[in-house]
């Protein structure tokens, strides 16, 4: 799977889309994990709705939320009053028994408020983007991750 | 009617190839999942592997994987199980079944049409 | 792999009799489980899919009970044509295995 880079502002709200085969993964819950270092596991965030027929309803955790367009096959992620230590890898997940297949690896970067004048040394990206390829609502931007590219930051 | 017709029977000498197809008909071939399943005489059941047409995903059971080679070809709506060197214990009859789409709480498809089924000899 | 392993292995039976065919896995499949039907020289039919659901077109003497590790299939009233062997599969992980059978004969 390709990394796709999603930016938004600190402070305001990200939304991340993970597209996918809608028959393929026909009857399946869907979930969103944050991917924890480079080769460890991926830990559940949220997850849609237990009955797979009301997984159009938004379902929260903390200030991340989950809804899954079942029909037209696309898994939606928002993540509210985005923080820098929401940066990191992330998956979107379909569900079934005890499998997880992947299907899109997130990169979330977060940007600094422009209006904010705050020290933001702490905020963290890989690089700048040299191709936006799809704009998305709710200030996010998206990208493939470039080849040669570091998913994470490097570890002192 | 939605049916899978699978290809006729096969008798093969050990160390030959052989790929034996699954057609399917009356649905959306390349929205369901197909499995391959092995009987072998007067014996219980064994899941092979299964693919998605859509995209070819594949999954096998770990017992057949690198013995048999599961693959679809979508423009023809048909799936296909193939051995590149048979043995004698790979005599059986062989199964194609569609997996279902269900959306209840769990996700268990269940194998929901089948083909009749391609008795497969080796012997030399 | 998963095991699913079925008891009895087979069983007399007569026509209106209650039969009860038990499946166990070898760990927690949640209600990720389905049984066939299969009579000599056909293919295996789907009866029930994710433990209790039956198929469409079944017959609603057939039932399936179960969660976890242990599941059941009973059909309440034994008909001549429900003579056959039946399997149990575990569709939580892959491999999608079957029990070993369970023969259902005539008394």
């Known amino acids: 799977h390709n990394t796709t880079v999603f930016q938004g502002v600190a402070g305001q709200s990200l939304q991340v889309s993970c597209p996918y085969d809608s028959m393929k993964h026909w009857g399946r819950r869907k979930a969103w994990c944050r991917q924890l270092g480079e080769k460890g596991p991926c830990q559940r965030v949220v997850s849609t709705h237990n009955l797979w027929l009301l997984s159009f309803l938004r379902r929260w955790n903390g200030s991340t939320a989950i809804t899954d367009d079942t029909l037209g096959g696309t898994l939606t992620i928002t993540l509210r009053n985005l923080q820098p230590h929401d940066a990191g890898l992330y998956q979107c997940q379909s569900l079934h028994g005890s499998e997880a297949d992947t299907l899109r690896k997130v990169l979330v970067e977060v940007l600094a408020d422009p209006l904010d004048h705050r020290d933001a040394g702490d905020l963290w990206f890989p690089g700048e983007s040299e191709s936006f390829e799809d704009a998305h609502v709710e200030h996010s931007i998206s990208r493939s991750l470039l080849e040669g590219e570091i998913p994470f930051p490097p570890t002192s | 009617e939605v049916q899978l017709v699978q290809s006729g029977a096969e008798v093969k000498k050990p160390g030959e190839s052989l790929k034996i197809s699954c057609k399917g008909s009356?649905?959306?071939?390349?929205?369901?999942?197909i499995g391959w399943v092995r009987q072998m005489p007067g014996k219980g059941l064994e899941w092979m592997g299964i693919?998605?047409?859509?995209?070819?995903?594949?999954r096998y059971s770990p017992s057949f994987q690198g013995q048999v080679t599961i693959s679809a070809d979508k423009s023809i709506s048909t799936a296909y199980l193939q051995w590149s060197s048979l043995k004698a214990s790979d005599t059986a009859m062989y199964y194609c079944?569609?997996?279902?789409?269900?959306?209840?709480?769990?996700?268990?498809?269940?194998?929901?049409?089948w083909g009749q089924g391609t008795t497969v000899t080796v012997s030399s | 792999d998963i095991q699913m392993t079925q008891s009895p292995s087979s069983l007399s039976a007569s026509v209106g009799d209650r039969v009860t065919i038990t499946c166990r896995a070898s760990?927690?499949?949640?209600?990720?489980l389905n049984w066939y039907q299969q009579k000599p020289g056909k293919a295996p039919k789907l009866l029930i899919y994710a433990a209790s659901s039956l198929q469409s077109g079944v017959p609603s003497r057939f039932s399936g009970s179960g969660s976890g590790t242990d599941f059941t299939l009973t059909i309440s009233s034994l008909q001549p044509e429900d003579f056959a062997t039946y399997y149990c599969q575990q569709e939580y992980a892959v491999p999608y295995t079957f029990g070993g059978g369970t023969k259902v004969e005539i008394k």
């Open positions: 009356g649905y959306s071939f390349t929205s369901y999942w």
């Open positions: 693919i998605y047409p859509g995209d070819s995903d594949t």
């Open positions: 079944a569609r997996l279902g789409h269900y959306s209840g709480t769990v996700s268990s498809y269940g194998m929901d049409v």
């Open positions: 760990q927690s499949i949640s209600s990720y």
